[in-house]
């Protein structure tokens, strides 16, 4: 039950995270005009990964796409790539995790297969989240660098007579959406990996109890033919420990309403 909840929650958290990564990638407000300590202008500039926009005080907003590929800064291209890789990995991860969900039965899919798929999707979500966080952080670093550079030469011009005010840009809403979304995807991925451990079946299908005779290193395994062939009781195998006869508590898997759709 706990495994199903962890897996389900991981899936939902990752789904929200990936939706956030997609939203952040599409948003225009990656960088917004810095209004603090700047001359008040009648226009407000903001930029995204794909286009830049200008909103006038008239309410008129004009957006222009970056129609060049080679003319764009390498950092911007890198951020685009990271975000797209994050989205693609996340989307594949979601697809895989749907089939891996414990509450969904597909044919005679074994728990080991579901465990592997859960782990795969978990890793994909982790990488997806890291890609988004990295992309947003690279862009934020680029902004900080440009901000201080433009602050250093806020006014440029000939002899100080005619001045050109450089527009400074600060963090836009998309950065925060990206960070949060990347974090959620990462958390979701970790939860899926944790759930995978609970889903993974052990190698053999019997309970092992070790009997240690003093002076001998012989392990006696009760159950005879039935145990060794895997027939008989529905108990799962346990690890053999040194130092006396002991067994872990039995964990039995009963069909529940959550095992069927």
């Amino acid at each position: 039950m706990a495994v199903t909840a962890c897996q389900g929650l991981g899936f939902v958290v990752s789904l929200i995270g990936i939706a956030g990564i997609i939203a952040a990638t599409c948003m225009d407000q990656w960088s917004t005009q810095d209004l603090y300590n700047n001359p008040v202008t009648a226009v407000f500039n903001y930029q995204g990964l794909w286009r830049s926009c200008v909103r006038e005080s008239s309410g008129f907003t004009e957006c222009r796409g970056y129609f060049t590929l080679l003319g764009l800064p390498a950092m911007l291209q890198a951020v685009r790539a990271l975000m797209i890789v994050g989205i693609v990995l996340g989307a594949i991860g979601l697809l895989v995790s749907i089939f891996a969900l414990k509450c969904i039965r597909i044919g005679s899919m074994e728990d080991s297969a579901k465990a592997n798929m859960t782990l795969t999707s978990g890793i994909m979500f982790i990488v997806s989240g890291l890609c988004a966080i990295a992309g947003v952080s690279v862009f934020a670093n680029m902004l900080v660098t440009n901000f201080w550079m433009s602050t250093a030469n806020m006014y440029t011009g000939m002899g100080g007579m005619v001045q050109t005010v450089q527009t400074r840009y600060t963090f836009g809403a998309a950065l925060f959406v990206g960070w949060v979304a990347g974090g959620l995807t990462l958390i979701g991925g970790v939860m899926m990996c944790i759930a995978c451990r609970g889903l993974a079946p052990e190698e053999t299908n019997y309970k092992a109890v070790s009997y240690h005779a003093s002076g001998h290193s012989v392990a006696y395994k009760p159950g005879g033919f039935k145990a060794s062939t895997g027939f008989g009781s529905n108990t799962k195998n346990k690890k053999i420990y040194d130092g006396g006869a002991r067994t872990e508590d039995e964990v039995q898997s009963y069909p529940s309403k959550h095992d069927y759709v």
Partner: antibody, heavy 117, light 113 residues
Framework: VQLQESGGGLVQPGGSRKLSCAAS????????MHWVRQAPEKGLEWVAF????????YYADTVKGRFTVSRDNPKNTLFLQMTSLRSEDTAMYFC???????????WGQGSSVTVSS | DIMMTQSPLSLTVTAGEKVTMNCKSS????????????LAWYQQKPGQPPKLLIY???TRESGVPARFTGSGSGTDFTLTINTVQAEDLAVYYC?????????FGTGTKLELK
């Protein structure tokens, strides 16, 4: 599109006056509005701007703290409350609609304010 | 505040002539975001409110005759009237539409010979 100013007249120095601008023929609540004045035989001087939703508001340095611009969108009316009036505030006051490029495409006929003792 | 300097202060022309008037701003009115210059030109005839001719430095307002042309970028702008007509006699103002407080030029008075 029509803009009609009213409320002008003779005011004593230090006195107050409230100008109104009635708008018609367009969706008033969707446009920012300006007040511009022109002293006798002088050039144009921008006074204030109020955006469609009443925020932000900007004022010329010469009137900051003395003039207040406001609007009543349901009544399609723009206001300019003038206090602590000085002789240099004597002018024809125009209201104008904000347009693309923050230019002013439609202007009222103006309302004359004379500050004199 | 942005200073808008217009030249000449007055122009005396004959009908049919080509007229050019200039406007210089103390700071660039070019917005890097959309590469537009936030400068407008107005025409004011005696006893009338101003009339918008040009916005974004070169975009003609609808209904304005094609003989009016705006040009320039950054800090230097020009209004050209290709063939002046009698009804063009007025005062022409340029305006900074970029920085608050918005500021107007001193004006150029167009007169007939």
């Amino acid at each position: 599109v029509q803009l009609q100013e009213s409320g002008g007249g003779l005011v004593q120095p230090g006195g107050s006056r409230k100008l109104s601008c009635a708008a018609s023929g367009f969706s008033f609540s969707s446009f920012g509005m300006h007040w511009v004045r022109q002293a006798p035989e002088k050039g144009l001087e921008w006074v204030a701007f109020i955006s469609s939703g009443s925020s932000p508001i900007y004022y010329a340095d010469t009137v900051k703290g003395r003039f207040t611009v406001s609007r009543d969108n349901p009544k399609n009316t723009l206001f300019l409350q003038m206090t602590s009036l000085r002789s240099e505030d004597t002018a024809m006051y125009f209201c104008a609609r904000n347009y693309y490029g923050n230019a002013m495409d439609y202007w009222g006929q103006g309302s004359s304010v004379t500050v004199s003792s | 505040d942005i200073m808008m300097t217009q030249s000449p202060l007055s122009l005396t022309v004959t009908a049919g002539e080509k007229v050019t008037m200039n406007c210089k701003s103390s700071q660039s009115l070019l917005n890097g975001g959309n590469q537009k210059n936030y400068l407008a030109w107005y025409q004011q005839k005696p006893g009338q409110p101003p009339k918008l001719l040009i916005y974004w430095a070169s975009t003609r307002e609808s209904g304005v005759p094609a003989r009016f042309t705006g040009s320039g970028s950054g800090t230097d702008f020009t209004l050209t009237i290709n063939t002046v007509q009698a009804e063009d006699l007025a005062v022409y103002y340029c305006q900074n539409d970029y920085f608050y407080p918005l500021t107007f030029g001193t004006g150029t008075k167009l007169e007939l010979k």
